[in-house]
């Protein structure tokens, strides 16, 4: 039992939380808090929005984003895409791992109506050392950040 607990303690895990700096408006991935409050990194590293894998294996990766708005913002595409994407060291391109699409504006018929929605993604994927996982939201203007409990991103080895 002691041995089991000890091996569990070294399993890579991370939980990152939304912060005021998460939304860059640059078209890049969301950025995350790594230390304050509920946020932590153990056996994984973080760089420019990405969780960086240092130990190969199967990981449960997850992300939730809180979405909200008043009516339908001008120029909003018909859907909001929330995805977890992988970067490998040889290619500039990202590969889709888990993606969801929402159409919250379909429900916001009144131009002044406040609406809330959320998107959660989670699944087990195999990741090699050196690979990175990032979260992207299109349109990020609709991501609502509060206290680190509404929008988050994490992973743990299974």
């Amino acid at each position: 039992l002691i041995q089991e607990r000890r091996s569990h303690e070294v399993n890579p895990a991370a939980h990152l939380t939304g912060a005021n700096s998460s939304l860059t408006g640059s078209g890049g991935p969301l950025l995350w808090e790594t230390q304050l409050g509920l946020a932590f990194l153990r056996g994984l590293s973080y760089h420019d929005g990405a969780l960086v894998v240092t130990k190969a294996g199967y990981y449960y990766i997850y992300s939730k984003v809180q979405l909200g708005g008043v009516g339908c913002p001008l120029g909003l595409a018909s859907t909001i895409t929330h995805g977890l994407y992988k970067r490998t060291p040889r290619y500039p391109e990202e590969l889709e791992l888990l993606v969801s699409q929402q159409s919250p504006c379909g429900r916001a018929t009144s131009s002044s109506r406040v609406w809330w929605d959320s998107s959660f993604l989670g699944g087990v994927v195999h990741l090699e050392a050196g690979e990175k996982v990032v979260v992207r939201v299109l349109d990020e203007r609709l991501v609502r950040l509060r206290d680190g409990t509404r929008s988050y991103f994490g992973a743990f080895m299974v």
């Epitope: 992988k86 490998t88 060291p89 040889r90 290619y91 500039p92 590969l95 195999h126 090699e128």
Partner: antibody, heavy 112, light 112 residues
């Protein structure tokens, strides 16, 4: 464990076509790009192109655009490269590769 | 296309030597996303190439720490601090910042 198993050696006539296969195992096929690379005997490496098996999207070296067609079958976790209008210059070892691992290579000999 | 020029073409060594291989690219390899997609591979006799160093200076899993990579922009270097028998073969540099991806001509590391 991760493996890229390529089809066996081929001896073909000039002017014909051949298909080389690359069967992936030990990982999720659609979450890694697959590259194809040519190596002539005693020579360097020439990049043919890359395919995203999840979407079928491809990028080619223009020097091979009229020569090679890359495809992928998600259901059998296999990438394919078809080479057409073969000449002696196409005789080479062809590798498929993931970013971190390469197949064992397929030797193609074009001879009449 | 980006031309990768390696030097020297052949490198005779004694076991235990420290050696350096250089690679120069004809274009800057810093991608618009800030990363430099420059890598080193080793092809041992009769085998497929294997990844040694990715993105300039990161050792791939299982690669001994006697291998180190450095450089930026257009000039890159692979250093082997103490050559062992298993290090013999042909070393290739490669870039994947610009399509088509390209490889250097290779540097053959051999015993004096």
């Amino acid at each position: 464990q991760v493996q890229l198993q390529q089809s066996g050696a081929e001896l073909v006539r000039p002017g014909t076509s051949v298909q080389v296969s690359c069967k992936a195992s030990g990982y999720s096929f659609t979450t890694y790009l697959i590259e194809w690379i040519k190596q002539r005997p005693g020579q360097g490496l020439e990049w043919i192109g890359v395919i995203n098996p999840g979407t079928g999207e491809t990028k080619y070296n223009e020097n091979f655009r009229a020569k090679a067609i890359m495809t992928a079958d998600k259901y059998s976790s296999t990438a394919y490269m078809q080479l057409s209008s073969l000449t002696a210059d196409d005789s080479a070892v062809y590798f498929c590769a993931r970013w971190d691992r390469w197949g064992q290579g397929t030797t193609l000999t074009v001879s009449s | 296309d980006v031309v990768m020029t390696q030097a020297p073409l052949s490198l005779p060594v004694s076991l235990g030597d420290q050696v350096s291989i250089s690679c120069r690219s004809s274009q800057n390899l810093v991608h618009s996303n800030g990363n430099t997609y420059f890598h080193w591979y080793l092809q041992k006799p009769g085998q497929s190439p294997e990844l040694l160093i990715y993105k300039v200076s990161n050792r791939f899993s299982g690669v001994p720490d006697r291998f180190s990579g450095s450089g930026s922009g257009t000039d890159f270097t692979l250093k082997i601090s103490r050559v062992e028998a298993e290090d013999l073969g042909v070393y290739f540099c490669s870039q994947s910042t610009h399509v088509p991806y390209t490889f250097g001509g290779g540097t053959k590391l051999e015993i004096k």
